[in-house]
Interface confidence: medium
């Protein structure tokens, strides 16, 4: 999946995850992902997105919440919650990649 086009210059985002090389990153958009694996506490990661924009369409479930935004450091103060409203198979963008 190519980088999302027509967004103009890259955006700077807060980066807080094991994959971060520093406190910020640059990408086509910013992300906050809250994931709860079975038997573990939810883990929240902040970073940059370049691929699979369709994931941004997914609404919260009891296991994952994937939020995207497009402005400078827009993911810095976003605090996500998990909401048991959909099963994972109902998330958008899963028919083809």
């Amino acid at each position: 999946d190519p980088v999302k086009p027509s967004r103009g210059p890259l955006v700077t985002c807060t980066c807080e995850s094991p994959h971060c090389r520093g406190p910020t990153c640059q990408g086509a958009w910013c992300t906050v992902v809250l994931v709860r694996e079975e038997g573990r506490h939810p883990q929240e990661h902040r970073g940059c997105g370049n691929l699979h924009r369709e994931l941004c369409r997914g609404r919260p479930t009891e296991f994952v919440n994937h939020y995207c935004c497009d402005s400078h450091l827009c993911n810095r103060n976003v605090s996500l919650v998990l909401e048991a409203t959909q099963t994972p198979s109902e998330q958008p963008g899963t028919d083809s990649q």
């Epitope: 086009p5 924009r53 919260p60």
Partner: antibody
Framework: QVQLQESGPGLVKPSQTLSLTCTVS??????????WSWIRQHPGKGLEWIGY???????YYNPSLKSRVTISIDTSKNQFSLKLSSVTAADTAVYYC????????????WGQGTLVTVSS | DIVMTQSPDSLAVSLGERATINCKSS????????????LAWYQQKPGQPPKLLIY???TRESGVPDRFSGSGSGTDFTLTISSLQAEDVAVYYC?????????FGQGTKVEIK
């Protein structure tokens, strides 16, 4: 001004495949800012969303139609298409193509719609 | 699927009077993390495609007259036409874009009394 225009046969025989194309003008279908949908409206009835496609080719289909639906995109022609297989009289409807903003916000541009009748 | 139920199915209102259309979703369409309601309203006149009026439950689309307003909470929503005009005669639909598949209400027909 963005415009969408549906085209395709107005009459399809039962068990055959309905094929429609939506041509987008006044804007690029390759923009990552939008998703492109097909929606239908049975005569005198409400609206039923069929599915969407993103510029990358990723799709999502209404589960009620998923086994019969294919949506594809041709960015070089600024078009996206709908194929609905094994049609019956129940598929007789006005078919609309529409544009949806990336972050949601509803369908802001629609085609005029094309009536497809399924009959032998 | 989220079921959208509108009421009434039709209503007749005198010119210049207020028209109120209700829409109820079978589950919440509020994305609480970002406090946004994933609900839109459309107007459809005979022989025309639907026209977007309101999105995010209460934001008017550009060019839509300010006599149209939307309000509501997680599951109960209202479209209000503050002073009905002759050109407002149409069918109005609510639409949720929170959970796929996107779904619409059955429509409310607004006529002049």
């Amino acid at each position: 001004q963005v415009q969408l225009q549906e085209s395709g046969p107005g009459l399809v025989k039962p068990s055959q495949t309905l094929s429609l194309t939506c041509t987008v003008s006044g804007g690029s279908i390759s923009s990552g800012d939008y998703y492109w949908s097909w929606i239908r409206q049975h005569p005198g009835k409400g609206l039923e969303w069929i599915g969407y496609i993103y510029y990358s080719g990723s799709t999502y289909y209404n589960p009620s139609l998923k086994s019969r639906v294919t949506i594809s995109i041709d960015t070089s022609k600024n078009q996206f298409s709908l194929k609905l297989s094994s049609v019956t009289a129940a598929d007789t409807a006005v078919y609309y193509c529409a544009r949806e903003r990336d972050y949601g916000g509803g369908f802001d541009y629609w085609g005029q719609g094309t009536l497809v009748t399924v009959s032998s | 699927d989220i079921v959208m139920t509108q009421s009434p199915d039709s209503l007749a209102v005198s010119l210049g009077e207020r028209a109120t259309i209700n829409c109820k979703s079978s589950q919440s369409v509020l994305y609480s993390s970002i406090n946004k309601i994933y609900l839109a309203w459309y107007q459809q006149k005979p022989g025309q495609p639907p026209k977007l009026l309101i999105y995010w439950a209460s934001t008017r689309e550009s060019g839509v007259p300010d006599r149209f307003s939307g309000s509501g909470s997680g599951t109960d929503f209202t479209l209000t036409i503050s002073s009905l005009q002759a050109e407002d005669v149409a069918v109005y639909y609510c639409h949720q874009y929170y959970s796929t598949p996107w779904t619409f209400g059955q429509g409310t027909k607004v006529e002049i009394k």
